[in-house]
Interface confidence: low
């Protein structure tokens, strides 16, 4: 039949060439002379001339050595024609398979591979994968089948078989326990790839395994015991710097210390923070310490790391004995601000109150008192007893010194410590009103027409407080009532002044006496300008010859 089975040809053949491979034969050659030809890549198209055919015999010829890694299979067509060029057979498929020779070594994809693994991991932990390729056939032959192995390990510590490599996948794993970054931070493995599944050509590369830091070392206090002296009352005072050592990688979470006060700070007086550079624990006072209440604190501080421990590690504990140093503390007025009610205008020398301070110190210190600020100079203070007395006239209505009925005085207490310390107190005198001011009209000058005059409305003011104010009463004195009339309007605390009789144009004094609800009387002279005019006037019309 006009068919050819696939032809296998080894690559890298030595010849001689041309080399006969197979004979094409048509059974039509009984009837007529047949001429054979081939077409296709490798024959009449690139790569041309690799194959040829003997025109009359049909022998398929190989003209040169083949390279499987370049072309692994050729597909040609065989043709048979008669002498007159007529085709006697359909084109026939000719498959030429190039069989592999082990003519390539394995090649690693990198000269140096890098991987990493945590220290202390269990055997079996995967580290990294390396890859080598081989251009030869790994499907039908072992020529391209690569087997991996570790040739050497540096350093050989704690021993020379810390890692293994999977012979077919190239996965490097830990095979032994004992990886310790603090002892060996990096291993260099020389790895091999061998084709023929380990029996052929070998190539080498390097795998660098970095041992990553795990928190397998606890921070340890060095020293473990501290003694400190802190002045009482100092807030934010640095008590002590606690030092730790940690064998893990500096500035990593496994090295950075976390401090915790675990005992001795019942009053929450202390706080501890980690210094970002030195890793020390900075113990400071969160609140002021009180020597008189407790003169010694024993603190227990534990240290761990920012990262959790990867194995059970003992927690280091430091003991800090804090001695509180006595400080001469300032006397404290009790209460710090004292409110006292006192009537205005009471006689000089009269007692206002006793205002004293306590000294927090244990020694019975002598305290002396004096007035620090007394804006009006109204008070005096006994230096020994703290007795406050009146030294001037207390005037509730004096707006220079009194605000909202309160007169504010600052007093001072000084102890006899070394050095002396001072404390201040505030004395707030609430001045009780006395009816010491009569009502006063405003304005005190008026202009009015002598014909059909408009009544003048005057506002009444009284500096005192209720009930020493309205209702007010008005009375005209010294014969002012002959020409004038005064009436109080209780609704709006005003007095209405009216001209009863004709007065010639001139200036007159109107004697107006106003009294308040407490009958405190105040005489005010109103200066009235009477003008020759009708009704409303602001100013007398010209000509005006005043007398």
């Amino acid at each position: 039949d006009w068919v050819v089975a696939p032809i296998s040809v080894p690559e890298n053949g030595k010849g001689p060439f041309p080399q006969r491979l197979n004979q094409l034969k048509s059974n039509k050659d009984r009837d007529t002379k047949i001429f054979y030809s081939i077409t296709g890549p490798g024959a009449d198209s690139p790569p041309e001339g690799v194959f040829a055919v003997e025109k009359e015999t049909g022998w398929l010829l190989l003209n040169k050595p083949l390279d499987r890694e370049e072309i692994a299979k050729y597909e040609l067509f065989g043709h048979a024609v008669s002498e007159n060029g007529a085709s006697v057979e359909d084109p026939m498929n000719i498959s030429i398979i190039v069989t592999d020779q082990n003519d390539h070594k394995p090649k690693f994809t990198q000269d140096t591979f890098r991987g990493s693994v945590l220290e202390g991991v269990l055997p079996g932990t995967s580290v990294m994968q390396v890859t080598a390729t081989d251009e030869d056939d790994a499907i039908h032959t072992y020529n391209g089948v690569v087997a991996y192995s570790i040739h050497s390990q540096e350093p050989k510590d704690p021993h020379d078989l810390m890692f293994t490599i999977h012979r077919s996948t190239g996965t490097i794993s830990v095979i032994s326990s004992g990886l310790d970054r603090e002892k060996v931070p990096e291993y260099t493995l020389t790895i091999q790839a061998t084709d023929m599944d380990g029996d052929g050509s070998t190539t080498t590369a390097v795998a660098v395994v970095e041992i990553l830091d795990a928190n397998d070392n606890a921070p340890v206090f060095d020293p473990q015991k501290y003694e400190s002296h802190v002045p009482e009352n100092a807030v934010g005072h640095e008590v002590q710097r606690l030092t730790v050592t940690d064998l893990d990688a500096p500035n990593s979470p496994a090295w950075r210390a976390t401090y915790l006060i675990v005992g001795g700070d019942d009053g929450d007086h202390f706080t501890i923070a980690t210094h970002p550079e030195s890793n020390q624990g900075i113990l400071t006072t969160r609140k002021g310490l009180d020597f008189e209440a407790k003169n010694q604190h024993t603190l227990y501080v534990e240290v761990t790391n920012e990262a959790p421990f990867v194995l059970k590690l003992p927690t280091s504990t430091a003991t800090i004995v804090v001695h509180v140093e006595d400080v001469n503390e300032a006397p404290v007025f009790v209460p710090p601000s004292k409110v006292v009610e006192v009537q205005e205008g009471i006689p000089t020398g009269e007692a206002v109150c006793v205002y004293t301070a306590k000294d927090p110190d244990k020694e019975n210190q002598k305290i002396s008192y004096r007035i620090l600020r007394d804006p009006a100079g109204w008070l005096a203070m006994d230096p020994d007893s703290g007795q406050v007395t009146v030294a001037g006239t207390l005037d509730r209505e004096d707006e220079r010194f009194v605000r909202n009925n309160i007169y504010e005085v600052m007093v001072l207490a000084v102890d006899n410590g070394s050095p002396p310390t001072t404390g201040t107190g505030t004395l707030l005198l609430t001045l009780i009103d006395v009816n010491d001011h009569g009502p006063v009209p405003e304005p005190r000058e008026i202009t009015i027409c002598n014909q059909s005059p408009e009544s003048q409305v005057l506002n009444i003011t009284d500096k005192d407080l209720s009930p020493h104010t309205s209702p007010f009463q008005a009375q005209l004195t010294d014969d002012s009532d002959i020409y004038w009339m005064a009436e109080v309007n209780e609704k709006d605390d005003t007095v209405v002044l009216s001209l009863k009789k004709f007065l010639k144009q001139d200036t007159y004094d109107v004697h107006l006496s106003l009294s308040d609800h407490g009958n405190k009387e105040q005489l005010t002279v109103i200066r009235a300008t009477v003008c020759d005019c009708h009704g409303h006037v602001e100013k007398c019309p010209d000509p005006w010859k005043g007398g």
């Epitope: 005992g263 534990e302 059970k312 003992p314």
Partner: antibody, heavy 123, light 113 residues
Amino acid sequence: QVQLQESGPGLVKPSETLSLTCTVSGGSITSYPINWIRQPPGKGLEWIGVIWTGGGTNYNPSLKSRVTISVDTSKNQFSLKLSSVTAADTAVYYCARSRGVYDFDGRGAMDYWGQGTLVTVSS
Amino acid sequence: DIVMTQSPDSLAVSLGERATINCKSSQSLLYSSNQKNYLAWYQQKPGQPPKLLIYWASTRESGVPDRFSGSGSGTDFTLTISSLQAEDVAVYYCQQYYSYPYTFGQGTKLEIK
């Protein structure tokens, strides 16, 4: 004699926050770490978390996103808050004292326990 | 998390006889630096909280009768009651405190045969 007593509502609605307090008497409240443990009806014990003497805490990772343990020294009380509760949080809740402050005391072992309080999560 | 597994789940023993409860941890509870096993045993009677019996795997808590003893190291531990008394009927739990979170065994119910 040290005594611990849990208290709080016996019924909590789903999705709400469970709040319990543990009152300590007969000893300084901040002298020892305090643990919270729970026990679903008819089941075993599950450790919830611990508060150390300095106020630091350590929680069970399975509950960490929902749990808060705190202390109010003025009231001699510890508190447990568990948010977004479901029926699976129905249990007897215990507070228990660690037997020591330091690792070398065996502080993971718990020597004094409260009587426990049953919390039911139901709508 | 470290898994604690107790065996058996329940146990019936005659009065005066020895009772043995086993506890196995998924990893070693022995810390080499101090050679201590971070394991405790508790007894829980119905309607009551657990009571600490043993810590450090073998140290008896004060006030616990000496018929209770703990042994074992690494991953395998045993609680032994040398002569069972009626008041020993309870559920017994082991607990590891080697690492967080602390975990308990599922419990062993001890009854009288």
